[in-house]
């Protein structure tokens, strides 16, 4: 969840006090502080909607609120893919899209959001209490996942409000490049704060919060985010899981039914590793098959950010994964 730093409203310095430089010195630390707190904490939202016309039809929409480039999106149901969930679709920004029944059409809605239409009947159709999860692998944030489902009382045609990451997994909360810049900024911020402590305090109104309070507050996880980290995986009604995973692509119009690779299992006890090889905790940056996703041992695509700085132990194609299947 995004933790916003509460930036106190600073009184404009009186003329002759610190002038323009003083104002910049006061504002810069808080801007940096906000960046330090919010950077590296992208958010994934999931929205599940049951279509009014077909009660067995669901539309799942997922989005990634982050500044990085998305290298892979995996949609699963019945919980996170590695924790008993079944992969429904995998979307790679350049290589293509893979789907498995009962997914009917997966597509990119924007560069950072996707939608998936599910439909079916009988055992392979979803039901209202099914949990749907979306996992976004991005550079440089790493891998983030959120799950959502329709509220039990949802009326057909209504959608559950977007759920911001009930299950958030930061396989990497920030990778070298950006992290380095942020680290520098944070160090600089601390340096400014220390200098600030040794100077006469600027004339802020007494009622204003002192810098120490917001600083402590900004760095402490919010109650919401703490709660999010403790939400257990939702219980799955297995009767809603697909009974058959066999699909055919008719010759008529373009069909989106296809098999998807499945992601590396999320281990319930800790951050999921995208790759299947053992990786140090929180270091499972997805490397997608080439391109933006350096697969185990391979060069990143020429057009994407170079991920070779963070090679997957398996080599360049590690990220290929679903679409590889992981």
């Amino acid at each position: 969840m995004r933790t916003e730093a509460q930036v106190p409203a600073l009184q404009p310095p009186e003329p002759g006090l610190e002038g323009a430089m003083g104002h910049r010195t006061l504002v810069l630390p808080w801007v940096l502080l906000t960046l330090c707190v919010t950077a590296g904490t992208p958010e994934v939202w999931v929205q599940v909607r049951m279509e009014a016309t077909e009660l067995s039809s669901f539309t799942i929409r997922c989005g990634f609120l982050g500044s990085g480039s998305i290298s892979l999106v995996t949609v699963s149901w019945g919980g996170p893919n590695g924790a008993g969930g079944t992969t429904l679709a995998v979307l790679h920004p350049e290589r293509g899209i893979r789907q498995w029944a009962p997914a009917r059409q997966a597509r990119w809605e924007t560069q950072s959001s996707i939608s998936l239409i599910l439909e079916g009947s009988g055992a392979s159709s979803p039901c209202a209490n099914t949990t749907f999860c979306c996992k976004f692998a991005s550079f440089p944030e790493g891998s983030w996942e959120a799950c959502g489902s329709l509220p039990p009382s949802s009326d057909p045609g209504l959608s559950a409000p977007p759920t911001p990451a009930p299950i958030l997994r930061a396989d990497l909360a920030g990778i070298l490049g950006v992290s380095g810049v942020l680290l520098f900024g944070c160090v600089y911020l601390l340096h400014l704060l220390r200098r600030h402590k040794h100077r006469p305090a600027p004339r802020l109104q007494p009622s204003r919060t002192s810098p120490q309070a917001p600083r402590a507050r900004a760095w402490a996880p919010s109650q919401a985010s703490q709660a999010a980290l403790h939400v257990p995986y939702a219980t799955i009604n297995t009767s809603c899981r697909p009974a058959t995973l066999d699909t055919a692509h008719p010759h008529g119009g373009p069909s989106w039914w296809a098999s998807l690779p499945t992601h590396a299992a999320h281990r319930p006890q800790g951050p999921a590793a995208w790759a299947s090889t053992p990786i140090p905790a929180r270091g499972s940056f997805v490397s997608v098959e080439n391109g933006l996703y350096a697969q185990a041992g391979e060069r990143p695509p020429h057009t994407g950010p170079g991920l070779t700085l963070f090679p997957d132990p398996r080599g360049p194609r590690a990220m290929e994964g679903p679409l590889g299947v992981r």
Epitope: T86, T87, H92, P93, E94, R95, G96, I97, R98, Q99, W100, A101, R107, W108, E109, T110, Q111, S113, I114, P242, L245, D246, T247, H249, P254, S255, W256, W257, A258, S259, L260, P261, T262, H263, A264, A275, S276, T277, E289, N290, G291, Q295, A296, P301, T303, R314, R317, E320, G321, P322, L323, G324, V325, R326
Partner: antibody
């Protein structure tokens, strides 16, 4: 190093069935779906279908539905394709290829002849 | 199904020359949501399986020489070999990676004079 090793050439009679294999190594087999592609002599490539080794889920090109059956054996990291009711039209080289077609097996030549 | 049409069916060039191969699809391969074209190019040498050269219409696969360049959008795509080498003698296929079933072009055979 990722490798896909396919079984050897097959000479089969019309109406019979054949099962060809593709053994994967150098990566975690269940992490990547496997495609199968047909290439008739002197002709182009046709996508047959693919399978998710994790749960056996399959996806087929309608043209090959009923002709090809895809399966996997996770314990041996091997994908299989069975072709049935063979005719001369099925004579071709069949390839397995990992998802996104970045890695291919060497191909298996199937010849259907009386 | 999406039909992929390649031209020319064959061509013969001298080493060092620039070559342009064309591929047209019967439907757009552009994904409007993320503005990416789902088209791939493969090279197949005699007696070998195809090798992925380009995906996403223009992204080179790892290890592919930079003399190979993919371009185009929508329904018209091009594979350019800036300076043909003797080892480039092969069949070149384009592929629809946009929607199922995946379909391939009939191929362009490149001969070296």
């Amino acid at each position: 190093e990722v490798q896909l090793q396919q079984s050897g050439p097959e000479l089969v009679k019309p109406g019979a069935s054949v099962k060809i294999s593709c053994k994967a190594s150098g990566y975690t087999f269940t992490d990547y779906s496997m495609n199968w592609v047909k290439q008739s002599h002197g002709k182009s490539l046709e996508w047959i279908g693919d399978i998710n080794p994790n749960n056996g889920g399959t996806s087929y090109n309608q043209k090959f539905k009923g002709k090809a059956t895809l399966t996997v054996d996770k314990s041996s990291s091997t994908a299989y394709m069975e072709l049935r009711s063979l005719t001369s039209e099925d004579s071709a080289v069949y390839y397995c290829a990992r998802v996104w077609f970045a890695y291919w097996g060497q191909g298996t030549l199937v010849t259907v002849s009386a | 199904d999406i039909v992929m049409t390649q031209s020319p069916s064959s061509l013969s060039v001298s080493a060092g020359e620039k070559v342009t191969l064309s591929c047209k699809s019967s439907q757009s391969l552009l994904n409007s949501g993320n503005q990416k074209n789902y088209l791939a190019w493969y090279q197949q040498k005699p007696g070998q399986p195809p090798k992925l050269l380009i995906y996403g219409a223009s992204t080179r696969e790892s290890g592919v020489p930079d003399r190979f360049t993919g371009s185009g959008s929508g329904t018209d795509f091009t594979l350019t070999i800036s300076s043909v080498q003797a080892e480039d003698l092969a069949l070149y296929y384009c592929q629809n990676a946009h929607s199922y079933p995946f379909t391939f072009g009939s191929g362009t055979k490149l001969d070296i004079k």
